[in-house]
């Protein structure tokens, strides 16, 4: 069976029907490049005006304008708000009332696209394997990133969160139109990784999505992650404005000027430092979501009532922090280089500035407890990775899981740890699952490109697709079309249950209280330490405009120094832990 032309609110669209075997039978309808909104530079997205005739939806559209990896050029385009749909079809009748899974990509709110990285037309976020194996509809889409998606003056002149609003427009479009593709508009699951996972979290917290989202999956990221909310948008807006020659004293004039500046210039005016800086690299993630008093009306910690009826899976990779550790402490990955106590202390103090010397010392002490007994470089390097993993991913995720569970009415809560080791041959032998290592398995790459993978990789992929799509179907990862290797029990506040995802998943894979000692440290010991005021002088950005990264400001609830008074945003980070 195949859909043919589908009528949407914008007009007719026609995709392609791809047979899954030479013998006919099952197939998948694929639609690429359906417009879901339009947007002017640094403005909220608007409904797409639509078209007459039948739109040929057969090619991915360009990604939203962003810097290249080298950060010296741009690619993509401003006209980028398009989505892609995969609809599995059986032999006879077209699919009807299928669960819908909407993917939000990661990339530090700075890069990425709905189709993902591409090698020889093999796109990372190709929805075919999830759709056909799980019998669900998969939707991916583009949203604005970098300055164009998240630049904000911290007031009404440039409220920011444009990229989040793009995401919302895509979700709302799916709600209004997916029935015509055979989807169930009342069963939408949003899922994402890294910045996409934090976006998923933020979308569930935003009042704008009331009634749109049934379930959510966050893979390595949360609204509570220290890198997910910018507390000093004005500082970074001024930095960009100076570079492109816009006034900085009056936010109204600055906004007006930025809106008419070449978008490519805006994009290139910001560079993320990839070489070691004074502070951990995440503090230089300038253009990220803000508490705007509207789309994100309050501190995320105060918005969990909005998730009371949204089923949630959240988890991390067991060495999510590795990617960041290699930038902050480059020796971590280098066999011939050593990590010193000073290196680690500097890293720790960069993540605990809000609590001053006492915070840094207490954190350093607990994380280095094992060093007396095992002072090996391997142990020290693993400690660096564990620390970054905890601060950036584990602790925020654990707090979010607890918040979700505590506020749940009908909602169910599940937790996982992805531990299938990285396949990167250049990594150390002790390496676990790095940040983003889970993506290939969720998107079924071991099946799509079997020559590049081992049977154990296919086992991991099969299990993840089964759990993820069952959850999308029923709200329970164990119940649905796909058999699973073991029962995944819901998260409870008492036991902190989580599923450890490895190549062999058995009943022993259900575990409890992940890194409980460290969770208690951050939530209790560290939390009660007095907050200190940072040295105002450290905040002066360099005069030299060519400087890649000015020292990031922050308010004193964050982990970097106190901002200039006029730069602070009213809403404070929660006092849950001192990020």
């Amino acid at each position: 069976a195949k859909l043919g032309a589908v009528y949407t609110e914008g007009g007719f669209v026609e995709g392609v029907n791809k047979k899954l075997s030479l013998l006919g039978g099952d197939s998948v309808d694929i639609f690429k490049g359906i417009p879901f909104a339009t947007a002017k530079t640094l403005e909220n997205p608007q409904r797409h005006p639509g078209w007459q005739g039948t739109l040929k939806a057969t090619n991915f559209k360009k990604r939203c304008l962003q810097a290249t990896i080298t950060q010296d050029n741009t690619y993509g385009q401003e006209d980028c708000l398009y989505l892609n749909i995969w609809v599995p079809q059986g032999r006879k009748q077209v699919s009807h009332n299928l669960p819908v899974m909407v993917w939000i990509y990661g990339g530090a709110f700075l890069m990425g696209s709905g189709q993902g990285a591409n090698f020889l037309k093999n796109y990372l976020y190709d929805g075919e394997e999830i759709a056909t194996r799980g019998n669900v509809i998969v939707v991916t889409f583009n949203y604005r990133v970098g300055p164009l998606g998240f630049l904000s003056t911290g007031d009404a002149n440039l409220p920011g969160n444009f990229g989040l609003r793009d995401q919302h427009m895509a979700i709302a479009w799916v709600k209004r139109n997916i029935a015509a593709f055979g989807g169930d508009p009342d069963n939408i699951t949003i899922f994402g990784e890294s910045a996409g996972a934090a976006s998923v979290s933020l979308q569930t917290l935003s009042p704008y999505n009331k009634g749109l989202i049934r379930r959510a999956i966050s893979q390595s990221g949360m609204a509570l992650s220290p890198w997910a909310i910018q507390k000093n948008p004005l500082f970074w807006a001024k930095t960009i404005a100076k570079k492109v020659g816009c006034p900085t004293e009056d936010t109204g004039k600055m906004a007006a000027c930025l809106k008419i500046t070449d978008p490519r210039a805006l994009t290139l005016a910001y560079k993320l430092p990839v070489k070691k800086q004074e502070y951990p690299v995440v503090h230089y993630l300038a253009f990220i979501p803000v508490i705007d008093g509207d789309f994100i009306p309050d501190d995320p910690i105060n918005l969990y009532n909005n998730t009371a009826d949204i089923d949630y899976i959240a988890g991390i990779n067991n060495m999510d922090g590795h990617l960041f550790a290699t930038i902050d402490v480059p020796a971590v990955d280098k066999t011939k280089q050593t990590v010193t106590e000073e290196d680690f202390y500097r890293l720790v103090s960069g993540h605990t500035v809000a609590k001053g010397l006492k915070g840094a010392q207490a954190t350093f002490d607990i994380y280095t407890e094992s060093w007396a007994q095992d002072p090996s470089q391997e142990n020290m390097k693993k400690t660096v990775v564990a620390f970054e993993t905890d601060v950036l991913f584990l602790i925020p995720t654990e707090i979010a899981l607890a918040q979700h569970k505590a506020h749940a009415k009908s909602a169910k809560t599940y937790s996982y740890l992805f531990s299938h080791p990285s396949r990167m041959p250049i990594y150390p032998k002790w390496m676990g699952a790095d940040h983003a290592d889970d993506l290939q398995y969720v998107f079924g790459k071991p099946f799509a490109t079997p020559l590049g993978y081992r049977p154990q990789d296919r086992a991991v992929s099969k299990a993840m697709i089964a759990y993820w799509t069952n959850f999308a179907r029923s709200g329970d990862p164990n119940m649905g079309n796909s058999p699973v290797p073991t029962h995944w029990y819901p998260y409870t506040l008492e036991n902190g249950n989580y599923l450890d995802i490895t190549k062999t998943i058995t009943s022993a894979s259900m575990k409890e209280h992940l890194r409980e000692k460290f969770l208690k440290f951050w939530a209790v010991t560290f939390e009660v330490l007095p907050t200190v005021t940072g040295d105002q002088d450290t905040l002066t950005p360099p005069e030299d405009d060519s400087e890649v990264a000015p020292d990031p400001p922050s308010d004193d609830s964050q982990v970097v120094p106190v901002p200039p008074t006029d730069d602070s945003v009213e809403a404070q980070m929660p006092a849950t832990i001192g990020f």
Partner: antibody
């Protein structure tokens, strides 16, 4: 200017079929979607379906699948709706209406055809 | 499909009076459109994209709303405004409200 001409009335027997016409003028017929809408005193306005005359693509309200068939004749710039297996429930005023543009409201309406199903 | 519920079903207003009618959607939509229909005639596009007036529509009419709640307002009722007003949403399955019949007192 844009005009959509529909016959004023049709009287048919239960069980029979009827093919209503909607002749378009004042614009390029093959460039705009044509919708059909049913109006009854009890049910108000109901969207039946849409056709793109340029290539014949159609979409129907689930409720009218199997009941209504939309076609278009490019040479005469006329859209048609055939209703089959008629019952008294099908008695209503039927309008053809052209998109104003993409996802805007229906901008141009015919005068409507009153269908009476009676033996 | 999205269900639109209009209220009230029937209302009457004196000349010069302010009139407000509402349209509630069963789930969030991006824009609402409104039609005016008088007996024996076809519906006319009246307000589109929630708040924009179609050409020829008097300035006393206005539309507003977002999400699931929308309204049409007449700042000062006139005799020629007596008609039935339908709200309308364009998703993949367009739907109409049941109509509000506005009578002159």
């Amino acid at each position: 200017q844009v005009q959509l001409q529909q016959p004023g009335a049709e009287l048919v027997k239960p069980g029979a079929s009827v093919k209503m016409s909607c002749k378009a003028s004042g614009y390029t017929f093959t460039s705009y979607n044509m919708h059909w809408v049913k109006q009854t005193p009890g049910q108000g306005l109901e969207w039946i379906g849409v056709i793109y005359p340029g290539n014949g693509d159609t979409s129907y309200n689930q409720k009218f699948k199997g009941k209504a068939t939309l076609t278009a004749d490019k040479s005469s710039s006329t859209a048609y709706m055939q209703l089959s297996s008629l019952t008294s429930e099908d008695s209503a005023v039927y309008y053809c209406a052209r998109d104003y543009y993409g996802s805007s409201p229906l901008g141009y309406w015919g005068q409507g055809t009153t269908l009476t199903v009676s033996s | 499909q999205i269900v639109l519920t209009q209220s009230p079903a029937v209302m009457s207003a004196s000349p010069g009076e302010k009139v407000t009618m509402t349209c509630s959607a069963s789930s969030s939509i991006s824009y609402m459109h409104w039609y005016q229909q008088k007996p024996g005639t076809s519906p006319k596009r009246w307000i589109y994209d929630t708040s924009k007036l179609a050409s020829g529509v008097p300035a006393r009419f206005s539309g507003s709303g977002s999400g699931t709640s929308y309204s049409l307002t007449i700042s000062s009722m006139e005799a020629e405004d007596a008609a039935t007003y339908y709200c309308h949403q364009r998703s993949s399955y367009p739907t109409f409200g049941g109509g509000t019949k506005l009578e002159i007192k």
